[in-house]
Amino acid sequence: GDLLIQKTIKKQVVLEEGTIAFKNWVKTGTEVYRQFWIFDVQNPQEVMMNSSNIQVKQRGPYTYRVRFLAKENVTQDAEDNTVSFLQPNGAIFEPSLSVGTEADNFTVLNLAVAAASHIYQNQFVQMILNSLINKSKSSMFQVRTLRELLWGYRDPFLSLVPYPVTTTVGLFYPYNNTADGVYKVFNGKDNISKVAIIDTYKGKRNLSYWESHCDMINGTDAASFPPFVEKSQVLQFFSSDICRSIYAVFESDVNLKGIPVYRFVLPSKAFASPVENPDNYCFCTEKIISKNCTSYGVLDISKCKEGRPVYISLPHFLYASPDVSEPIDGLNPNEEEHRTYLDIEPITGFTLQFAKRLQVNLLVKPSEKIQVLKNLKRNYIVPILWLNETGTIGDEKANMFRSQVTGKIN
């Protein structure tokens, strides 16, 4: 009985043509949606003039269908038992699942102004930037449509820079018609306990963004894990969105459409400061913003974003230190809504339901030479938006799963 089931499972979770795993792996059978909530700034003038707390009001959800494209350039390597691929990016707006349209306007931080002032610290260069900011009538904040903010717009200030720079700015620009990877993952043929574990990403085993173990590409991409998952396991996975590997721990048993699954969650410890979690020392890359590595709950990924001061956190600064959220009014973190979880069917290791939640923030600092940042008295990690990417196994697939996997075991 059990041995036969194990043998069947081992055979069917291998990533090669003809297996159940492979079919669902190449093109996910699950509908995946990415919901966005934008933080609309209510008091831009007061912030710019008096360095007041930033008052934000979240607006959303604005929903896009994502991950509907099949993996590309899927290539098996029989020698090292790996399969390589590109994960193409695509997003389709879903008006019926959204509170408004892509043309809705938001008052948000001026991404180009914040980024340029951070990248170019030289005071003379900042004076040049100041001239261009003034000339383009740009300010610390800007009004942008959802479409512009997410997918890109031509920035008027950057358009005046007299040497070659990318003048298109957007939080996810470029996205459509791009791909993530190349990923090279173990196909499990020789060792099923390695199936779906990433061997290399973009041709490397390390990211080059972090020091020491923080730079490692660990585990899978979280879409699946090697089979026979135990509750005691710490599940490692790599997320290119946050430019790092992270981990999830068992939280509870959940029944998903009649299928027993394990709910694994990202623990607060993963976001802790090195003071509380020494393993995180290498995610602290500078001493000033992090208050000598005592701040927690925000991750500086600027090295992964061409120097732009992007900080990733959980929505509403969940699990973040009070100093991070103190300058921002209007945030209400709660675990249920804002944490990330994976519901994993333990026998196959497949993720049958997930909610990936993260927040994109941008650092803006006072600048003596940039007029629109001159009156700031403190640094702000400004929330721009948060997202909830979810997928749940469809009813038909769940029936199939129950009959072919869990039903056979029970």
Partner: antibody
Framework: EVQLVQSGAEVKKPGSSVKVSCKAS????????MQWVRQAPGQGLEWMGG????????AYAQKFQGRVTLTADKSTSTAYMELSSLRSEDTAVYYC????????WGQGTLVTVSS | ETTVTQSPAFMSATTGDKVTISCITS??????MNWYQQKPGEPPKLLIS???TLRPGVPSRFSSSGYGTDFTFTINNIESEDAAYYYC?????????FGQGTKLEIK
């Protein structure tokens, strides 16, 4: 010790161009911008423009826009100021000077424009 | 453009005297004012930089004050070697602009 050494005096005809060099030593050239200032005989100081060798960022005073070109060669730690369409009122001592606060100055290059 | 109005254009003093030079700017420049001394045939020399900061090696008889639009440069206990032209420069915004200069003569 920081030193800025400029090229020698020049006599130029009206309508021609002049290129003044400024060789820096004693510090990492790309760490600081180079500014250019001129001083006509018996007159005050006038800022012409500046260049940041690291980023290539350049700013010119409106008065010189289109006539002055600033360049910097990181490999030789040398900054250059070229002024074209010279007229008699461009007769002056031209200085290169480091940073926003002009903390170190070259010895000056006298450019005489005369027919 | 920030214009800088420097006064007086000329002043005469005796050794041991105290003199002050004023620079007024057309816009608020915080404390981004610099002061220079220039002797005949020499390039200017930075005495005081932004934030009223006396440069290393500059005698303490030189000082400055001011913030916003009104700035004052002071020489206490004047010595004969202080005979020179003095210039102020605003480094808050582009274009960088100088005052017209003050000629200090020692009697």
């Amino acid at each position: 010790e920081v030193q800025l050494v400029q090229s020698g005096a020049e006599v130029k005809k009206p309508g021609s161009s002049v290129k003044v060099s400024c060789k820096a030593s004693g510090y990492r050239f790309s760490d600081y911008e180079m500014q250019w200032v001129r001083q006509a005989p018996g007159q005050g100081l006038e800022w012409m423009g500046g260049i940041d060798p690291e980023t290539g960022g350049i700013a010119y005073a409106q008065k010189f826009q289109g006539r002055v070109t600033l360049t910097a060669d990181k490999s030789t730690s040398t900054a250059y100021m070229e002024l074209s369409s010279l007229r008699s009122e461009d007769t002056a001592v031209y200085y290169c000077t480091r940073k926003l606060d002009f903390d170190y100055w070259g010895q000056g290059t006298l450019v005489t424009v005369s027919s | 453009e920030t214009t800088v109005t420097q006064s007086p254009a000329f002043m005469s003093a005796t050794t041991g005297d105290k003199v002050t030079i004023s620079c007024i700017t057309s816009t608020d420049i915080d404390d981004d004012m610099n002061w220079y001394q220039q002797k005949p045939g020499e390039p200017p020399k930075l005495l005081i930089s932004e934030g009223n900061t006396l440069r290393p090696g500059v005698p303490s008889r030189f000082s400055s004050s001011g913030y916003g639009t009104d700035f004052t440069f002071t020489i206490n206990n004047i010595e004969s070697e202080d005979a020179a032209y003095y210039y102020c420069l605003q480094s808050d915004n582009l274009p960088l602009t100088f005052g017209q200069g003050t000629k200090l003569e020692i009697k």
